[in-house]
């Protein structure tokens, strides 16, 4: 037995989280994703910035590019050519939108240890990539695509019509980047580099969003972005393919759009190469409940691409929109015609299906009241996928292997019992032929990345175990977390509750609801995080709850599609229902309940505050949507249809935050937005503020000049400090 004095002093070495800890990123974790270059080799950037090649079979490592070379051009990223003769080095990174950025590229010749001189690349480049075989280069500069057979060769210009904000070749416009692809590129090499496919987006008729960027000049700049809001004119997309061996011979050939798609407004959703002479395109009607997958073949005689109707596969939803957040992508098998794909089964759960001839004859591979989430890899004898099947927790992710070589196919959970307490949420990264794979576990314990044998699933080594983080957390009083469910009127509401370290059920605590709630999202996940809400529980003694209500993902179509054409209703109702249930638990101070959210969560938190229930004392909306007429067409119409009289205009009008301005009178409301938000435009908050002023309702507001939807950098510190003060004041907590 130890004297109580000693015990107490040990207790006292434990400290609560501080806001500073969160803002400094003191407790951030690392993951390790190998950059695979073969079945048994991967590259990784070491802590001291050398580019190191690892051979798993031999255990040896090789520095292929020194930090000295990286530093000589201030490189922050690299890319090895598949023939391993060259490396591109990326510097002068300049962020544009969510994924897009421009950069300067230098090509380093590994065979002589020098940078390639002559025919250097122009700057800044919008996108650059190696061919999958050899060292051809494709790049996009000033919205046009260029091709180099070798890095030192002069470029061949593939497109000529590229024009800023008008025609985009090989890169997406704003809405395709954010809501459809979602990538920074729109070009795809065929497996052996024979062909290059690319998208052309014509934005000439799209209305432009314009906002001021204040900078520090005498006059602000105006940022103009072609941005289709709900119901507006959309980009016109075309897909072309060019032979990269003889690019000038016939030039780019357009791939035909399926007739049933081309008859009205449509989208291109993805392109998947099957072989060098077979390509698969996915198209979607503007009313996003019909998707067509079209398999096209190269006709040598005509030098064109043929997409027979017999190779068109239709995916349709009668209860909602096609797919989950996006329409899923096919994973082709070795016969180069059949494929595996995730879509809803007859019971309304997303599952893996095998399509050999028609979708109607699809063979269901997985089934159950859970969902298959991602197909990682298909080999000759195995299919690797993730799902939330294990122990019926929708917020978990485990990796499974199905043997497809034998009948009946056998299923094995690769991750379920590896580190059961620590790891319940995995993703994976596979080497060629799935010879090896890395598992990245995100929690609920401290994240860990491991390397495994693709045949036996044996763990070979730990790639990253976050030992420093583990040590740093040893003297921190972290909050307790629990994931449970509420059953309400035949709806299951999963929730995560974050409880103060010395939580006592007999006491009363202030409650903060953190909400996102957007269609096909999931907030209640078994992942590790030390963030702002961890601090609020640890230091400020709040209870924080996250609730996945109707419209959220991975629990079946009934829950997911419940919000179809009716955004802003059930998501809010379910948050309110959950709060009432939490009050019934007995440890919530019902006079001190708040709600906050960002983006879609800002919309939901605003509507919850204005619900007239009297449940919430205060709340915060960061960068909220305030009317669906202000948001992007691709996203909004997927869930709401069109804002026209003969479609769904009535609900567009009924679901605005402004329509509820009067109801904010009895709550404390903090409204926050960045003035340079390219995504959810400042217009949204400007209109809320105007409606509140017109209704003579008091509220608090903060804008962040020249900040986008992420409110990054110094704004982040200011934001969380400001929100903390607001909540502490609301909950009468001393500073």
């Amino acid at each position: 037995l130890r004297p109580s004095r000693v015990h107490n002093s040990e207790e006292n070495t434990m400290r609560a989280l501080t806001l500073k800890d969160i803002l400094n990123g003191t407790f951030s974790y690392k993951t390790f994703f190998p950059n695979w270059i073969s079945g048994q080799e991967y590259l990784h950037q070491s802590a001291d910035n050398n580019i190191v090649l690892y051979n798993i079979e031999t255990g040896q490592s090789y520095t292929i590019l020194s930090n000295r070379t990286m530093k000589s051009v201030n490189a922050s990223n690299y890319g090895l050519s598949p023939d391993r003769q060259f490396v591109y080095l990326e510097s002068d990174y300049s962020k544009l939108w969510r994924y897009s950025y421009t950069a300067t590229y230098y090509i380093y010749d590994l065979s002589n240890g020098e940078f390639v001189r002559g025919n250097e690349l122009p700057r800044p480049i919008q996108y650059l990539c190696w061919s999958p075989v050899g060292s051809k280069l494709a790049y996009v500069y000033q919205n046009n695509i260029y091709l180099k057979q070798r890095p030192g060769d002069p470029p061949f210009q593939i497109t000529f019509n590229g024009r800023e904000n008008k025609i985009f070749n090989g890169i997406p416009d704003w809405v395709y980047e954010e809501e459809m692809l979602p990538t920074k590129y729109a070009l795809w090499w065929s497996p052996n580099g024979k062909f290059l496919a690319y998208a052309e987006f014509n934005d000439k008729d799209i209305p432009v969003i314009a906002y001021s960027y204040y900078g520090d000049e005498q006059y602000p700049r105006t940022i103009n972005i072609p941005y289709p809001k709900a119901g507006a004119k959309n980009p016109v997309v075309r897909i072309f393919i060019i032979d990269t061996t003889y690019p000038a011979y016939v030039g780019p050939q357009e791939v035909p759009v399926p007739a049933m798609i081309a008859s009205s407004d449509y989208y291109f959703s993805w392109l998947t190469w099957v072989t060098d002479e077979r390509v698969c395109l996915q198209w979607l009607k503007r009313v996003q409940n019909v998707s067509v997958l079209s398999i096209c073949d190269f006709r040598e005689d005509w030098q064109t691409w043929d997409c027979p109707k017999t190779q068109e596969h239709i995916e349709e939803s009668r209860t909602g929109w096609a797919g989950g957040f996006f329409v899923s992508r096919p994973v082709f098998s070795y016969d180069a015609i059949s494929y595996y794909k995730i879509f809803s089964d007859k019971d309304g759960y997303k599952h893996i299906h095998y399509i050999k001839d028609t979708v109607e004859n699809a063979i269901q591979i997985t089934s159950g009241k859970w969902e298959a989430i991602n197909i990682f890899r298909v080999t000759q004898d195995s299919l690797f996928y993730s799902s939330n099947e294990f122990e019926e927790y929708p917020g978990r992710r485990n990796i499974y292997r199905i043997s497809i070589g034998s009948y009946p196919p056998s299923k094995k959970c690769v991750t379920c019992h590896l580190r059961k307490e620590r790891c319940q949420y995995y993703t994976a990264s596979f080497s060629d032929y799935a010879k090896y794979y890395a598992l990245v576990c995100y929690g609920p314990g401290i994240p860990i990345s491991t390397l495994h044998d693709g045949r036996t699933d044996q763990e070979i080594k730990i790639l990253e175990e976050n030992k420093e983080l583990e040590n740093a957390l040893k003297n921190i009083q972290l909050p307790k977390e629990e994931i449970k469910k509420l059953e309400v009127d035949e709806i299951t509401l999963w929730y995560k509750m974050i409880l103060p370290p010395q939580f006592d059920r007999s006491k009363k605590y202030p409650l903060l609801i953190q909400v996102y709630g957007g269609p096909c999202s999931q907030s209640v996940r078994s992942v590790f995080a030390v963030n702002w809400i961890s601090y609020l529980a640890s230091k400020e003694g709040m209870v924080i709850a996250l609730v996945d209500g109707r419209g959220t993902a991975f629990q079946g179509d009934k829950l997911l599609y419940a919000v179809y054409r009716k955004l802003g209703v059930y998501e809010v109702e379910d948050q309110i229902t959950a709060v009432r249930k939490f009050i019934e638990m007995g440890f919530i101070d019902e006079k001190r309940i708040a709600i906050w959210g960002w983006s879609y969560g800002g919309y939901v938190s605003s509507l919850a505050l204005a619900s007239g229930t009297g449940l919430f004392k205060c709340g915060i909306a960061v960068a909220p949507v305030s009317s669906w007429e202000y948001y992007a067409s691709v996203y909004t119409e997927r869930f709401m249809g069109l804002p026209t009289k003969d479609d769904n205009l009535e609900h567009y009008k009924n679901s605005t935050v402004m329509a509820r301005a009067e109801y904010f009178r009895n709550v404390d409301y903090l409204l926050i937005h960045g003035t340079a938000d390219d995504n959810v435009h400042f217009q949204n908050s400007a209109q809320i503020a105007k409606a509140l002023v017109n209704a003579q309702v008091d509220f608090q507001a903060m804008w962040y000049s020249d900040q986008n939807h992420g409110l990054s950098g110094l704004s982040t510190n200011h934001l969380y400090t400001h929100m903390t003060h607001f909540l502490k004041q609301c909950f009468s907590l001393s500073d």
């Epitope: 090649l53 090789y62 090895l80 023939d83 391993r84 003769q85 010749d109 002589n112």
Partner: nanobody, 123 residues
Framework: QVQLQESGGGLVEAEGSLRLSCAAS????????MGWFRQAPGKERELVAA???????LYAGSVKGRFTISKDNAKNTVYLQMNSLKPEDTAVYYC?????????????????WGQGTQVTVSS
């Protein structure tokens, strides 16, 4: 087709040195990447060092700073100078060649091989 013949192996004490040579036949020797692999009993054959046609080099982390690869195009020969040898360097050393880049560490990527020469480092 390239024929390769190693020489220079033998028994040496720890901390000692050895120089391996690999003579290649063929007129286009200068355009090949050359590598030295080794295989200890019961272990995978691993790349120790490689040199590209342009003269740049690659070393396994375990030998970096101790081994040096070089080549003489006029003599169609590639060398491996091994200093500060350790008992764990004991293995059969093989010379290998490939057209294209040198930065391949897997045995399957090197089509041309010599017969090997034994290096034994005693403690």
């Amino acid at each position: 087709q390239v024929q390769l013949q190693e020489s220079g192996g033998g028994l040496v004490e720890a901390e000692g040195s050895l120089r391996l040579s690999c003579a290649a036949s063929g007129r286009t020797f200068g355009s090949y990447a050359m590598g030295w692999f080794r295989q200890a009993p019961g272990k995978e054959r691993e790349l120790v060092a490689a040199i590209s046609s342009g003269g740049s080099t690659l070393y396994a982390g375990s030998v970096k700073g101790r081994f040096t690869i070089s080549k003489d195009n006029a003599k169609n020969t590639v060398y491996l100078q091994m200093n500060s040898l350790k008992p764990e360097d004991t293995a059969v050393y093989y010379c290998a060649a490939r057209s294209g880049g040198a930065y391949y560490t897997a045995r399957v990527d090197w089509p041309y091989w010599g017969q090997g020469t034994q290096v034994t480092v005693s403690s």
